[in-house]
């Protein structure tokens, strides 16, 4: 079958990295510089993606595969195949149309991207605040006030480390 198909269409013999050159009696010619063909039997090679401007080359174009881009430092990829680059912010900030802005009180962002999110409301789960929130970190919820004995602190000391073979004290 393969041989029959080859007789019918000489282009089917052209491997990836080449194209079937109609100008040269349908012989397989290598893809020109800055172009590629990722499959066999192609009648043209595709121009390579060019990583320019805010984009940087993550993977160079070869005769058989396209270039891949990522973003220059200070930016992160958005969109299919890193088609856009969005400015990074610091933790504790979010990106607005006017640039990076600190998270408002009661919100936090622990990443360089994304938006500021509200602190967890511990009381909704019947818990108390164990560690206060900051612009960079969410609050840490502790046991509910009812679980604490009268006069006890809401911050419990860490449990002693257990050694292997010892039962808890």
């Amino acid at each position: 079958f393969e041989r029959t198909r080859s007789l019918q269409d000489p282009c089917s013999n052209c491997p990836a990295g080449t194209f079937c050159d109609n100008n040269r009696n349908q012989i397989c010619s290598p893809c020109p510089p800055n172009s590629f063909s990722s499959a066999g039997g192609q009648r043209t090679c595709d121009i390579c993606r060019q990583c320019k401007g805010v984009f940087r080359t993550r993977k160079e174009c070869s005769s058989t595969s396209n270039a891949e881009c990522d973003c220059t430092p200070g930016f992160h990829c958005l969109g299919a195949g890193c088609s856009m680059c969005e400015q990074d912010c610091k933790q504790g900030q979010e990106l607005t149309k006017k640039g990076c802005k600190d998270c408002c009180f009661g919100t936090f962002n622990d990443q360089k991207r994304g938006i500021c999110r509200p602190w967890t409301n511990c009381s909704l789960d019947g818990k108390s605040v164990l560690v206060n929130g900051t612009k960079e970190r969410d609050v840490v919820c502790g046991p509910s006030p009812a679980d604490l004995s009268p006069g006890a602190s809401s911050v419990t000391p860490p449990a002693p480390a257990r050694e292997p073979g010892h039962s808890p004290q």
Epitope: I47, Q50, V54, G74, F75, C85
Partner: antibody
């Protein structure tokens, strides 16, 4: 507010050279990620991309005009330049400078354009 | 270089009409395609980037779609201020523009 203001256009003799300027304000040409380029439009015709320079100084040129074009910038003046040599009648056009990307999301499009400067090549 | 072919080159339409402009690339450029509007004596204005994202301040009647080699700009209900010339632009490899589509009053 981002602003781009071109200057340097006017009447030029065939075979001569021109140097266009584009003064940028509201952002710095040397800020990471920023890329600025030149695009022209002949009277009654479409848009033609010419050249682009990014914050790191990397340059891209139109294949057909590469031998006659030089893009450069002066960071201290926050100004972009385009030099075009061996001018011909067909170089008569409005020349625009434009910034790649938008405010905080950057990519291969132009969100900010200058008003353009008209170059007429004629004897 | 990658060629972009817009169709139609010009069209006549009335206020309220739905208008569709197509842009065909000589090879796949997805999603690195933008659309611009240009009025006489003015600089182009970005409408759509990355094939389908509306630029800041652009009304929702403008939408972009498509992938690979075929892209479309749609104006759902043409307004008086929309009579202009529209260009597509690819940024996949260097930059090229379509030849433009002039939208005129019928």
């Amino acid at each position: 507010e981002v602003q781009l203001v071109e200057s340097g256009g006017g009447l030029v003799q065939p075979g001569g050279s021109l140097r266009l300027s584009c003064a940028a304000s509201g952002f710095s040409l040397s800020t990471g990620g920023v890329a600025v380029g030149w695009i022209r439009q002949a009277p009654g015709k479409g848009l033609e991309w010419l050249a682009l320079i990014d914050w790191a100084g990397d340059k891209s040129y139109s294949t057909s005009l590469k031998s006659r074009l030089t893009i450069s910038r002066d960071n201290s003046k926050n100004t972009l330049y385009l030099q075009l040599n061996s001018l011909r009648a067909e170089d008569t056009a409005v020349y625009y400078c434009a910034r790649g990307g938008s405010d905080t999301v950057l990519g291969d499009w132009f969100a900010y354009w200058g008003q353009g400067t008209l170059v007429t090549v004629s004897s | 270089d990658i060629q972009l072919t817009q169709s139609p080159s010009s069209l006549s339409a009335s206020v309220g009409d739905r208008v569709t402009i197509t842009c065909r690339a000589s090879q796949g450029v997805s999603p690195y395609l933008a659309w611009y509007q240009q009025k006489p004596g003015k600089a182009p204005k970005l409408l759509i980037y990355d094939a389908s994202n509306r630029a800041t301040g652009i009304p929702s009647r403008f939408s972009g779609s498509g992938s690979g080699t075929d892209f479309t700009l749609t104006i759902s209900s043409l307004q008086p201020e929309d009579f202009a010339t529209y260009y597509c632009q690819q940024g996949y490899s260097t930059w090229t523009f379509g030849q433009g589509t002039k939208v005129e009053i019928k």
